[in-house]
């Protein structure tokens, strides 16, 4: 017969380590007992537990409440044990000694390695503004044992750079994502992806990009000058811009105060029935925390327009 085991066992910090020791023998062979010990620098070996075919499991005081047999169903030839709630101090070598009848004794050693999974953190960089050069968008840090892998998942064009710092049996990895900010990046996700053998799946932390910008301002409403005639109702000027943070709008008249009855509602300037007094230069002011813009238009209210609406009515009435 022979022992089936593994010379390297890996467990995640805080989880249960299965230390395998299975006797593969002839059908008439029996396992009397399995003695488990830790190979110790001082005492040579330190007993963990004894599995007896007749008397069951006996755990040494130093490992009380920490050593169990795997859950049933159990094979009588299986001498494996569970070391519960593994800590880094459990790293080292373990030995199982199997006493069989009639084949005699067998022993095997294995190494236990404890993985420490990372707890990643994402830190956004300084505020992003359109017009900046290459700027730090975010950094992501993860520390684990062994070293974790830190990468970025995003549609945004940019450059990744990472640095790592080793301690004894662990490493801290920091990856930075740099980009040239543009308004098209606004609201785009930037995801830090951390891989580690102690994680069941990659850990992902998403940061939504905010790029401050303010577009040039323009005014809509004067496309057809013929519509700006005395008596027209519902005439409006709309200021067009775009920004992050969303901009605030303000209207002024270059050559004096706004005429009475002219109302400002956000980005729109609303006129009462037009008179020639509404003629003038109007300025739309757009601003946010980043910048301010302005656009001006000249309104000329026509005194004696040809009224195409009335002409149509006359034709239809004749």
């Amino acid at each position: 017969g022979e022992l089936e085991t593994s010379d390297l066992v890996t467990v995640v910090l805080g989880q249960d380590a299965k230390l395998p020791c299975f006797y593969r023998g002839d059908p008439d062979e029996q396992v009397g007992q399995v003695a488990w010990a830790r190979v110790d620098p001082n005492e040579g070996t330190r007993e963990l537990a004894l599995l007896h075919s007749k008397y069951g499991l006996h755990v040494s005081p130093a490992y009380e409440d920490r050593v169990e047999q795997p859950p049933p169903p159990r094979d009588p030839l299986d001498g494996s044990i569970l070391l519960r709630n593994a800590v880094q101090a459990d790293e080292g070598e373990y030995e199982c000694r199997v006493s069989t009848f009639p084949a005699g004794s067998f022993q095997a050693r294995m190494r236990l390695r404890v993985l420490v999974p990372p707890l990643p953190s994402l830190n956004p960089g300084p505020p992003l503004e359109e017009g900046q050069g290459l700027t730090l968008a975010a950094s992501c840090t993860a520390e684990g044992s062994p070293a974790p892998s830190v990468t970025w998942d995003t549609e945004v064009k940019g450059t990744q750079s990472s640095r790592s710092f080793k301690h004894s049996r662990s490493a801290a990895v920091t990856s930075e994502f740099h980009l040239v900010p543009s308004r098209s990046m606004n609201g785009q996700p930037l995801t830090c992806v951390v891989s580690h053998p102690g994680l069941l799946q990659d850990q992902r932390i998403t940061h939504t990009l905010q790029v401050a910008f303010l577009a040039e301002a323009s005014v809509r409403g004067l496309e057809d000058q013929n519509l700006w005639h005395v008596g027209r109702e519902g005439a409006t000027l709309k200021c067009l811009s775009e920004g992050q943070p969303p901009p605030k709008y303000n209207w002024t008249r270059l050559d004096g105060p706004l005429p009475s009855g002219v109302r400002v509602k956000g980005d729109t300037l609303g006129f009462p029935p037009l008179t020639t007094e509404h003629s003038g230069v109007y300025v739309c002011h757009v601003s946010n925390e980043l910048s301010s813009r302005a656009s001006q238009v000249t309104v000329e209210v026509l005194a004696d327009p040809e009224d195409p609406g009335k002409q149509v009515d006359l034709v239809s009435a004749s």
Epitope: D7, G92, R109, S149, S164, K166, S168, R169
Partner: antibody, heavy 116, light 108 residues
Framework: QVQLVQSGAEVKKPGASVKVSCKAS????????IHWVRQAPGQGLEWMGW????????NYAQKFQGRVTMTRDTSISTAYMELSRLRSDDTAVYYC?????????WGQGTLVTVSS | EIVLTQSPGTLSLSPGERATLSCRTS???????LAWYQQKPGQAPRLLIY???NRATGIPDRFSGSGSGTDFTLTISRLEPEDFAVYYC?????????FGQGTKVEIK
């Protein structure tokens, strides 16, 4: 700074044994496993096994089981690798390396020549 | 055991060029368990990259590692004269620890 200094070159006859030493300095010797790797002339790297300087526990590659013995002396921070029943194809440079998951520090190597 | 296959066997390039070295593993390997080493004639190997993508202390940033699963890559962005050497990948996640057979980067 971390250093692993190995013993000098050896010439051995087939069937003999060789014992190579690896003295560690600049760190706590018992805090890291020591591995042994060999490299035949013009060939790649071949892992032989490890020793835990803290416990004395060892693990050998199957190819070398029964022929290799790794030991340590913690009082002088030195690891040893003994290879017995030498054959001509054991001619190689033997390296010790410190394990920090990967092998972050290596000895300078010891050339062992097996020749009749 | 996990077999590591490196390609190409030899890479002939000029200083200033970009070198891309491949390492394929016979079974999936966690990126945390993959390293790259550089070895020059008559010298011991030197750790370049650990955890597939992390540069070891003192390694210039022209060296970078990437990959996951069974496909890993070492890239040297602009070859310097001192970069011409043999490069080995290694997995240390399962026993036995294994190395690739090496890629020699030589001057064209």
């Amino acid at each position: 700074q971390v250093q692993l200094v190995q013993s000098g070159a050896e010439v051995k006859k087939p069937g003999a044994s060789v014992k190579v030493s690896c003295k560690a300095s600049g760190y706590t010797f018992t805090g890291y496993y020591i591995h042994w790797v060999r490299q035949a002339p013009g060939q790649g790297l071949e892992w032989m096994g490890w020793i835990n300087p803290n416990s004395g526990g060892t693990n050998y590659a199957q190819k070398f089981q029964g022929r290799v013995t790794m030991t340590r002396d913690t009082s002088i921070s030195t690891a040893y690798m003994e290879l017995s029943r030498l054959r001509s194809d054991d001619t190689a440079v033997y390296y010790c390396a410190r394990e920090d998951w990967d092998f972050d520090y290596w000895g300078q190597g010891t050339l062992v020549t097996v020749s009749s | 055991e996990i077999v590591l296959t490196q390609s190409p066997g030899t890479l002939s390039l000029s200083p200033g060029e970009r070198a891309t070295l491949s390492c394929r593993t016979s079974q999936s390997v966690s990126s945390s368990y993959l390293a790259w080493y550089q070895q020059k004639p008559g010298q011991a190997p030197r750790l370049l990259i650990y955890g597939a993508s992390n540069r070891a202390t003192g390694i210039p940033d022209r060296f970078s590692g990437s990959g996951s699963g069974t496909d890993f890559t070492l890239t040297i962005s602009r070859l310097e004269p001192e970069d011409f050497a043999v490069y080995y990948c290694q997995q240390y996640g399962s026993s036995p620890i294994t190395f690739g057979q090496g890629t020699k980067v030589e001057i064209k």
